[in-house]
Structure formats: structure tokens, C-alpha cells
Interface confidence: medium
């Protein structure tokens, strides 16, 4: 776990787990079939998902100055996606196999968020949007949209932890 009082997290552990997250996110939503045929419906959107942006202090300078801003943002995102993956969007029909990568992804998101959460310290978490598609195909489409935005999120997080492990580890 991260040490209380805003000290550095276990960068190397975080790096390893975030790399695993990247692999799982891509296996949960790889390209399938004749991708020219893929086109999104506009039934549901995932505009409310967290993004790591310029002002979040996740750039090399920001991480050097105070990594807590960036780590808090990453933590919020991890909790947000962990909640989404545990919601009926993913547990409802169409059913996923019990050992699907989504299940492993869910557990790994929780693992990394716990690694970042300082003991006795609770960062604010973002409210997940109330997305409840009525049709199974809409739910399936929403799953893929969520997974695609998660791929982007964990890719940035993995780069942050790789940088931290290389330059900020004690």
C-alpha cells in the first residue's frame, strides 16, 4: 500500500499491476471479426468516464513536484471503472463466462486502487453515471465503449507508473 501522509506509492508494484491491467483490458475488448463492419450506435454514451488530463499533474514535472494529485486522479478512475465492471451493465445479459477477462480486470482494478489508497485516507470517488440499457445488444455495445475508454485510461496510468518506477522509486 501507499504510505500514509502522502508519501510515494510502491511504484514498481503499481507498474507491474498497471501493465497487467493493460493486457487484460485489451483481451476483454480486442478487435473481433471484419472490423470495417463496426460502427457505433448512439443509444448510450460514456462521456462521463474519467480521463487523465493535462492539469492532473501526471506529466513528469507534476509527478516530481507532487505525485499525489496524479495518483488521486488515477485512483478515482480505477474505482469508477471497478464499479462499472461490477454493475448490471456487465453482470446482465448477454452473460460472460465466469473466467472471462472482465472478471480478472475487475479484480485487478480493485487491487491497484487498494495499492494506491493510503491507510486511513479516503480520496473522493466519482459518481458512476446511471446507465441501464433496456436491450441486451445496447448493453453489449455499452460494455465495449466502456472497455475502450478503460484501455485508454490504463494505458496512461501504466505510463505514469513506468515513469515513477524508473525515476521516483527510492
Amino acid at each position: 500500500r501507499a504510505v500514509p501522509g502522502g508519501s510515494s506509492p510502491a511504484w514498481t508494484q503499481c507498474q507491474q499491476l498497471s501493465q497487467k491491467l493493460c493486457t487484460l483490458a485489451w483481451s476483454a475488448h480486442p478487435l473481433v471479426g471484419h472490423m470495417d463492419l463496426r460502427e457505433e450506435g448512439d443509444e448510450e454514451t460514456t462521456n462521463d468516464v474519467p480521463h487523465i488530463q493535462c492539469g492532473d499533474g501526471c506529466d513528469p514535472q507534476g509527478l516530481r513536484d507532487n505525485s499525489q494529485f496524479c495518483l488521486q486522479r488515477i485512483h478515482q478512475g480505477l474505482i469508477f471503472y471497478e464499479k462499472l465492471l461490477g454493475s448490471d451493465i456487465f453482470t446482465g445479459e448477454p452473460s460472460l463466462l465466469p473466467d472471462s477477462p472482465v472478471g480478472q480486470l475487475h479484480a485487478s482494478l480493485l487491487g491497484l486502487s487498494q495499492l494506491l489508497q493510503p491507510e486511513g485516507h479516503h480520496w473522493e470517488t466519482q459518481q458512476i453515471p446511471s446507465l441501464s440499457p433496456s436491450q441486451p445488444w445496447q448493453r453489449l455495445l455499452l460494455r465495449f465503449k466502456i472497455l475502450r475508454s478503460l484501455q485508454a485510461f490504463v494505458a496512461v496510468a501504466a505510463r505514469v507508473f513506468a515513469h515513477g518506477a524508473a525515476t521516483l522509486s527510492p
Epitope: 480486442p30 471479426g33 471484419h34 463492419l37 460502427e39 463466462l97 465495449f144
Partner: antibody
Framework: EVQLLESGGGLVQPGGSLRLSCAAS????????MVWVRQAPGKGLEWVSS????????HYADSVKGRFTISRDNSKNTLYLQMNSLRAEDTAMYYC?????????????????WGQGTLVTVSS | DIQMTQSPLSLPVTPGEPASISCRSS???????????LDWYLQKPGQSPQLLIY???NRASGVPDRFSGSGSGTDFTLKISRVEAEDVGVYYC????????FGPGTKVDIK
């Protein structure tokens, strides 16, 4: 009620052309992938062609590639299949169907509902 | 292309009794994303096909719960817990992992 209604089938000589139509109602046609599937008399089902909601991308079975063209007019809620250079082996009942599976696999699947079909007979 | 086989090709059934149809693919239909890309369709006599099961095991809207799909990889099964007279017709499996291909069909009729 979600409905698909095919038309345009008939008797045509080998080498001839036909244009099939599929009129959709009861759903927002412009949001859905659509497909054509055919069934030769007394035989099984064969996927023919698919099209994305905008009409901007299409895909064909090898057996019809270069001869058939799938298209759609979202303003008219209608799907089309232009069939040229017809052969005896194209004789079949042609069904259009709404394709829900393209949101999980680019190949499609999960076809629901299907139209009642239109019969195409290629014979001299 | 992936080849699909079904067995039996003909299945005489007794109303009230269970029935089972097997579908095999020449390669696994289980994708790494956790979905089996297999559908089941029923074509009743003189009618167009109708969707029964999608993605291996999910019952389509309006399909009676006596129908169930199971299996993974290359071996799939469609079960009817208690056959009714209206269940007669030809049952097709279809793979959607690669270029779409249907099985040859299983004709179910009353004994």
C-alpha cells in the same frame, strides 16, 4: 411492432439482374446493421451480405462478390440488394434481417427479426 | 472458413419429452473476450427463421424458457426441456467469429 418486408423477387434468366428491397418498420432503421441471408430450395441458410448503419461499409460472401451490391436508404427505411450476372445457383428465398451482433463481432450474427422472404428464380 | 456440423440431422420427438441438438465447429468459437460467437435459429415449416439463442447461451427476447443453449469452444448444445408441438421445424446453429457460416440444420418433427 418490428417488421421487415422483402419484395422484388421473381423469375429471371441467367445473366440477368434483379433488385430486392426490404422495407423496415417499428424501429429506428438508421441505427442498425442489416444483412441479407438466402436459402436455396430444400437447402440450408447462407449469409449473403452485410451493411453498417450509415451504409458506408459493406461485406459479401465469396459466392456473390463482384455481382451483388447491398445498399440502404435510411430516409426511406429501406434495404436493397442489387443482383447482377445472376446464375442458376442464385435461385433461393432471400431474407433480410436486422443484425444485432455486429456490436460484438464485426462479422455480425444475432439476427432478429427476419423478413418473410422473397423468392428469386434464375432459369432459362 | 469455419465449418459447422450438427447432429442428429433428423430428430423425431415426443411432446413433453426433452430433446437435444449438438453443434460442432471446426475451430473454437470462444474469443479471448469471454464470448462464444454462436447463435441458434429455428425455422418453422413455411416460415422464416427466428433467433432462439445468441452468443452461445443467451435466450432471445420472447423465446420460451424451455429452450437453453450451452457449451463453449467447439461443442455446443441446444436443449428443449419439454418439447411442444409448435417446436417442430429445422434448427440451425451459426458461427459469427469469422465469415458467417450456418450448420446444415437439424429437422425436428413429432414421432
Amino acid at each position: 411492432e418490428v417488421q421487415l418486408l422483402e419484395s422484388g423477387g421473381g423469375l429471371v434468366q441467367p445473366g440477368g439482374s434483379l433488385r430486392l428491397s426490404c422495407a423496415a418498420s417499428g424501429f429506428t432503421f438508421s441505427r442498425y446493421h442489416m444483412v441479407w441471408v438466402r436459402q436455396a430450395p430444400g437447402k440450408g441458410l447462407e449469409w449473403v451480405s452485410s451493411i453498417v448503419p450509415s451504409g458506408g461499409s459493406t461485406h459479401y460472401a465469396d459466392s456473390v462478390k463482384g455481382r451483388f451490391t447491398i445498399s440502404r436508404d435510411n430516409s426511406k427505411n429501406t434495404l436493397y440488394l442489387q443482383m447482377n450476372s445472376l446464375r442458376a445457383e442464385d435461385t433461393a428465398m432471400y431474407y433480410c434481417a436486422r443484425d444485432l451482433g455486429s456490436y460484438s463481432s464485426g462479422w455480425g450474427g444475432w439476427f432478429d427479426p427476419w423478413g418473410q422472404g422473397t423468392l428469386v428464380t434464375v432459369s432459362s | 472458413d469455419i465449418q459447422m456440423t450438427q447432429s442428429p440431422l433428423s430428430l423425431p420427438v415426443t411432446p413433453g419429452e426433452p430433446a437435444s441438438i449438438s453443434c460442432r465447429s471446426s475451430q473454437s468459437l470462444l474469443h479471448s473476450n469471454g464470448y462464444n460467437y454462436l447463435d441458434w435459429y429455428l425455422q418453422k415449416p413455411g416460415q422464416s427463421p427466428q433467433l432462439l439463442i445468441y452468443l452461445g447461451s443467451n435466450r432471445a427476447s420472447g423465446v420460451p424458457d424451455r429452450f437453453s443453449g450451452s457449451g463453449s469452444g467447439t461443442d455446443f448444445t441446444l436443449k428443449i426441456s419439454r418439447v411442444e408441438a409448435e417446436d417442430v421445424g429445422v434448427y440451425y446453429c451459426m458461427q459469427a467469429l469469422q465469415t458467417l457460416t450456418f450448420g446444415p440444420g437439424t429437422k425436428v418433427d413429432i414421432k
